[in-house]
Amino acid sequence: TTSAEKNTCQLYIQTDHLFFKYYGTREAVIAQISSHVKAIDTIYQTTDFSGIRNISFMVKRIRINTTADEKDPTNPFRFPNIGVEKFLELNSEQNHDDYCLAYVFTDRDFDDGVLGLAWVGAPSGSSGGICEKSKLYSDGKKKSLNTGIITVQNYGSHVPPKVSHITFAHEVGHNFGSPHDSGTECTPGESKNLGQKENGNYIMYARATSGDKLNNNKFSLCSIRNISQVLEKKRNNCFVESGQPICGNGMVEQGEECDCGYSDQCKDECCFDANQPEGRKCKLKPGKQCSPSQGPCCTAQCAFKSKSEKCRDDSDCAREGICNGFTALCPASDPKPNFTDCNRHTQVCINGQCAGSICEKYGLEECTCASSDGKDDKELCHVCCMKKMDPSTCASTGSVQWSRHFSGRTITLQPGSPCNDFRGYCDVFMRCRLVDADGPLARLKKAIFSPELYENIAE
């Protein structure tokens, strides 16, 4: 590909006050935005969309609604109890013509295990998806349908980062023109063939994902075919050449010393904001050692924090992060020993991440306790283990078969965990609630949009 190729989708990312409340600081929120964008950037860059390669993402602008904005009448996301469709609509009612896509990140528990919602792109004649411009719709409102939303909460629990990253990639996949995967070729996780099944489903699977199977962060051939057609037709409308960092997006990118946003956002005494002249913007002010925008080991007084200060909390699988006294970045935390229990004894630590099932501690692998006749539905939200590659030995941790390891104690999945072979999520009552993949779409059909738009929104 030539350097002049338009392959970068510029994003506008907003976060609501609930997302801020969960993560606690602007810096932590920006770190979340950054990790989500990096994750989808890696997925899309490494996918060959029928000859279209190196599709990348860049944050053009962010807006962080803090808890102080909860009562601000100009903040459209201030309402506490909004359904997922309304939440997407609030995003779509803003004008997002300057962006390829505009997303809102939240920490809301939407109904029925919904983790995100987005408008689906199409090669022609459709409203929605990448590069879509604001226009008037039949309900009399102007809308930008180059939009989506994601939440980090499901049935009262917070989803692991890898799941949230895949949710983001999934919703953006809709914007890029991919419907949900269907058919045996593109839903291998539903296969009866154990070899195929163990690699899991692809990004655009309609229901649940654990995020740790081989296919979980890849696009299926079905998705690639659909996305390729949309990219072919639409990317010249708003994609840009990759290259320069964007001063003002709050993220310190290559070529920038710091980035505290634009003048209306910058609360930083250490960094020149993005409205400053070219030679100064996103540079440290004279005599300042660092900027909090560079990382949590910089004080508001623009000096590196001392050696003993904590910059990251202890987690299930990693010890607390401690500043080293000579950088603003928080050094990597030491991992806790492999096979340490985590996520309330349902998983184990592997290389500092809560990644493996508790079954792995005993040389077993996790499985779904489900009988084809539906008799054992009460066990769908138990952690169940089987001998490697032997589904006939799948039994609950509370069963006599595994009592040598679990002493007859039933370990239940955390609320929000995938269950019943990724068909649903466990709720707080330990019932496996099937995901109705097209529920919000069905509800929107009864709402304000004209019939030709019905097919262009998806979870």
């Epitope: 005993y362 040389g363 077993l364 001998k387 032997d390 006939s392 030995t393 039994a395 069963s399 006599v400 078969q401 595994w402 009592s403 040598r404 390891h405």
Partner: nanobody, 123 residues
Framework: EVQLVESGGGLVQAGGSLRLSCAAS????????IGWFRQAPGKEREGVSC????????YYADSVKGRFTISSDNAKNTVYLQMNSLKPEDTAVYYC????????????????WGQGTQVTVSS
């Protein structure tokens, strides 16, 4: 190589007793669970009793509770099944099986099996 050898079967009158032995070799005895299973002609293999060698915990099928006792002699790497008050319906080929991970009376969970010993209870 894992080997399990059953012995002690035979013909006995109803109400009588037998003691079956299962001699194990080729693995670390203390890491395993040993189960006794039986299969009558034309019927599926069913679990009778099992023992976890490391902690001596035991488990019995309802049909044999109070009549059969499982035990182990770790020095001899042998598990025993003492069968009292035998009934004609106890007639079957009796197998012992071993597994490093599992426990219980489901034969699917056991990796290693002996050849079996015949027990016949006449009325």
């Amino acid at each position: 190589e894992v080997q399990l050898v059953e012995s002690g079967g035979g013909l006995v009158q109803a109400g009588g007793s037998l003691r079956l032995s299962c001699a194990a070799s080729g693995f670390t005895f203390g890491d395993y669970a040993i189960g006794w299973f039986r299969q009558a002609p034309g019927k599926e293999r069913e679990g009778v009793s099992c023992i976890s060698i490391s902690d001596s915990s035991t488990y019995y099928a309802d049909s044999v509770k109070g009549r059969f006792t499982i035990s182990s002699d770790n020095a001899k790497n042998t598990v025993y099944l003492q069968m009292n008050s035998l009934k004609p319906e106890d007639t079957a080929v009796y197998y012992c099986a071993a597994d490093r991970l599992a426990y219980g009376l489901d034969p699917n969970f056991y990796d290693y099996w002996g050849q079996g010993t015949q027990v016949t209870v006449s009325s």
